[in-house]
Interface confidence: low
C-alpha cells in the first residue's frame, strides 16, 4: 500500500538551514506529484510547495518562496523540501502529501515531522512544586502540582507516582516563553484526607537534554 | 489567491446529531473542493473529494454538496470518532488554499470550574522567579475568563494560559494560568488573587492568598 | 472560446479496438493537459487518462494502465484515445476536458459532449 514516510525534522536556529525527506513507497513515485504542507502549533493546515511529477514545475507559497526548495529524485523514491533563511514562523509539523491520480487533492499523508526555528539551546526543565494549601482545597478535594520551567526543546513528559495515578491528573500543553523556552504545569486532584498519609510524586522526562527528576509535592510547613 | 472560509470555528454537538459545516470560497471553484479530518497528533484524513465524493472506506454518513462559491460538510448522524477538526480545501488553483479548520467538540452540560491557586514555591524564590499559578478544573464550555489582581491592581501582560484537550469521559476541559514576576517584584506586594469568569458560576470566584503567610 | 468535439465512438466487440479523437477548436491547445473521462450508465463520471502538456507525458487510471494509449497532435490540435483488448465494463460515455493549470489539478475548464462507446460480450 501507498507509504509516505518522513524524516529530517528538529530544533535549528533562525538564518540557518535544514531538509525534509520524504520516502515514498507502495507506487511508482515518478508518476505523481507531491507536495508538502505545513501546520503551525495549534493552527490550520498551510500549502507550501509542488513539485509536479517530472520535475518540470514547481510552485511556492508566498510566505516560503526564494527560501524553500522542492525536489525530488526518482531512484531514490524521495521528495525534498530544503529550507534556508528558517524564520520562528516556519516552525510547524511539515507533511508530505500525495495526490489522487492528477486530482490535486490529499490522498495519502506522511507522518508528519517538526521543525522548531529557535535561538534557545537545548535546556533541562526546573521542577518546582505546586503544594497543596487551603488555597488549593476544596470540598473534601485537593488539588497539587508540579511546574516544568524553563526547558526546550519540546516534549517532556510527566507522571505521577511512576504511572500508578492517573485518575484526576492533567498536564497541560506546553507554552512558550517570551524567552524562548518552554513551561508547563501538571495537577492533580485528591482527596484532601490522603494528603497525610499518601506520597505524590511527580515524574519529569526531558529526553532532548537527558534530564529526569522526581518530585515530591507536599503540603507547605509552616 | 483563492481564500476559503469555514464557518463555524468551533461546534458543539452530541452523539447522534446531525451537523453541517460551511466552507466559502472567494470566488467560483466549480466543484474542485475537498474535506479532511483531523485528531490531535495525526495527520489528516481525506473525507471527500469533487465537493460531494466520498473517498473509499469513509462512512456514508459524511455528505458533501456544493458547487460555485459554497459548500457544505454534513455529518448526518454523529459518531464518538466523529469528534475532530475538519478542513475543507480548494483545487482549483495552483495555490493549494485550505480553510481555518472547524472543530467539533462533545456538547456536555455547563459545569463550573473548581478554583485553586498556588503560591511560587521557596525553591523557585531561590532562583530570582515567581510564577504564581490558578487551576481552573473541570468546566464546561471551554470560554472562561481569568484575571491576576496584585494588591487589588489589574494585571496584564505577564500571564500565560493552557488549556487541556476536552476530556473524554466527562467533555469538561481544565485550564492553568501562570502569573509570572521577579522575585523583587513579587515580595514588593501581598495579595495575589486570580478572579475567574464563567457561564457555570452566577458571579465571579476570587482565590487569592496573602504572601508569606500559610 | 474553447469547444472540444469527440469522435470515434461506437459499437465494438470483447476484445476488439477503438480510437477516439478530440478535436479542440478556439485555442491552441499544446500548452495544456487534456484528460479523458468516461460515465457508464448511472454511475459517477470517472478519469481514464491525460495527455499532459507536450513533452510531459501522460497518466493512466488503474483500469485503462496497459490497454488505452492517449497521444496528441498539437499540429492538428487533436489529442487520441486508443483504446485496446475493450471489455464490456469499458462500456460508458466518453469525455475529453481540457485542464488550463499547470499542475492539472483537476479543475477541468472545458468539456466535450461526449462519444457512446458500447462493448458487447
Known amino acids: 500500500q501507498v507509504q509516505l514516510v518522513q524524516s529530517g525534522g528538529g530544533v535549528v536556529q533562525p538564518g540557518r538551514s535544514l531538509r525534509l525527506s520524504c520516502a515514498a513507497s507502495g507506487f511508482t513515485f515518478s508518476r505523481y506529484t507531491i507536495h508538502w504542507v505545513r501546520q503551525a502549533p495549534g493552527k490550520g493546515l498551510e500549502w507550501v510547495a509542488v513539485m509536479s511529477y517530472n520535475g518540470n514545475n514547481k510552485h511556492y507559497a508566498d510566505s516560503v518562496n526564494g527560501r524553500f526548495t522542492i525536489s525530488r529524485n526518482d531512484s531514490k523514491n524521495t521528495l525534498y523540501l530544503n529550507m534556508n533563511s528558517l524564520r520562528p514562523e516556519d516552525t510547524a509539523v511539515y507533511y508530505c502529501a500525495r495526490i489522487r491520480d492528477t486530482a490535486m487533492f490529499f490522498a495519502h499523508w506522511g507522518q508528519g515531522t517538526l521543525v522548531t526555528v529557535s535561538s534557545a539551546s537545548t535546556k533541562g526543565p526546573s521542577v518546582f512544586p505546586l503544594a497543596p494549601s487551603s488555597k488549593s482545597t476544596s470540598g473534601g478535594t485537593a488539588a497539587l502540582g508540579c511546574l516544568v520551567k524553563d526547558y526546550f526543546p519540546e516534549p517532556v513528559t510527566v507522571s505521577w507516582n511512576s504511572g500508578a495515578l492517573t485518575s484526576g491528573v492533567h498536564t497541560f500543553p506546553a507554552v512558550l516563553q517570551s524567552s524562548g523556552l518552554y513551561s508547563l504545569s501538571s495537577v492533580v486532584t485528591v482527596p484532601s484526607s490522603s494528603l497525610g498519609t499518601q506520597t505524590y510524586i511527580c515524574n519529569v522526562n526531558h529526553k532532548p537534554s537527558n534530564t529526569k527528576v522526581d518530585k515530591k509535592v507536599e503540603p507547605k510547613s509552616c | 489567491d483563492i481564500q476559503m472560509t469555514q464557518s463555524p470555528s468551533t461546534l458543539s454537538a452530541s452523539v447522534g446529531d446531525r451537523v453541517t459545516i460551511t466552507c466559502r470560497a472567494s470566488q467560483s471553484i466549480n466543484t474542485w473542493l475537498a474535506w479532511y479530518q483531523q485528531k490531535p497528533g495525526k495527520a489528516p484524513k481525506l473525507l471527500m473529494y469533487k465537493a460531494s465524493s466520498l473517498e473509499s472506506g469513509v462512512p456514508s454518513r459524511f455528505i458533501g454538496s456544493g458547487s460555485g462559491t459554497e459548500f457544505t460538510l454534513t455529518i448526518s448522524s454523529l459518531q464518538p470518532d466523529d469528534f475532530a477538526t475538519y478542513y475543507c480545501q480548494q483545487y482549483n488553483s495552483d495555490s493549494k488554499m485550505f480553510g481555518q479548520g472547524t472543530k467539533v467538540e462533545v456538547k456536555g452540560t455547563v459545569a463550573a470550574p473548581s478554583v485553586f491557586i498556588f503560591p511560587p514555591s521557596d525553591e523557585q524564590l531561590k532562583s530570582g522567579t515567581a510564577s504564581v499559578v490558578c487551576l481552573l478544573n473541570n468546566f464546561y464550555p471551554r470560554e472562561a475568563k481569568v484575571q491576576w489582581k496584585v494588591d487589588n491592581a489589574l494585571q496584564s501582560g505577564n500571564s500565560q494560559e493552557s488549556v487541556t484537550e476536552q476530556d473524554s469521559k466527562d467533555s469538561t476541559y481544565s485550564l492553568s494560568s501562570t502569573l509570572t514576576l521577579s522575585k523583587a517584584d513579587y515580595e514588593k506586594h501581598k495579595v495575589y488573587a486570580c478572579e475567574v469568569t464563567h457561564q457555570g458560576l452566577s458571579s465571579p470566584v476570587t482565590k487569592s492568598f496573602n504572601r508569606g503567610e500559610c | 472560446q474553447v469547444q472540444l468535439q469527440e469522435s470515434g465512438g461506437g459499437l465494438v466487440q470483447a476484445g476488439g479496438s477503438l480510437r477516439l479523437s478530440c478535436a479542440a477548436s478556439?485555442?491552441?491547445?499544446?500548452?495544456?493537459?487534456v484528460s479523458w473521462f468516461r460515465q457508464a450508465p448511472g454511475k459517477e463520471r470517472e478519469f481514464v487518462a491525460v495527455?499532459?502538456?507536450?513533452?510531459?507525458?501522460?497518466f493512466y487510471s488503474d483500469s485503462a494502465e496497459g490497454r488505452f494509449t492517449v497521444s496528441r497532435d498539437d499540429a492538428k490540435n487533436t489529442v487520441y484515445l486508443q483504446m485496446n483488448s475493450l471489455k464490456p465494463e469499458d462500456t460508458a460515455i466518453y469525455y475529453c476536458?481540457?485542464?488550463?493549470?499547470?499542475?492539472?489539478?483537476?479543475?477541468?475548464?472545458?468539456w466535450g459532449q461526449g462519444t457512446q462507446v458500447t462493448v458487447s460480450s
Open positions: 495527455a499532459r502538456r507536450t513533452g510531459d507525458g501522460a
Open positions: 476536458a481540457i485542464d488550463s493549470s499547470t499542475f492539472y489539478t483537476g479543475s477541468y475548464d472545458y
Open positions: 478556439g485555442r491552441t491547445i499544446s500548452r495544456y493537459a
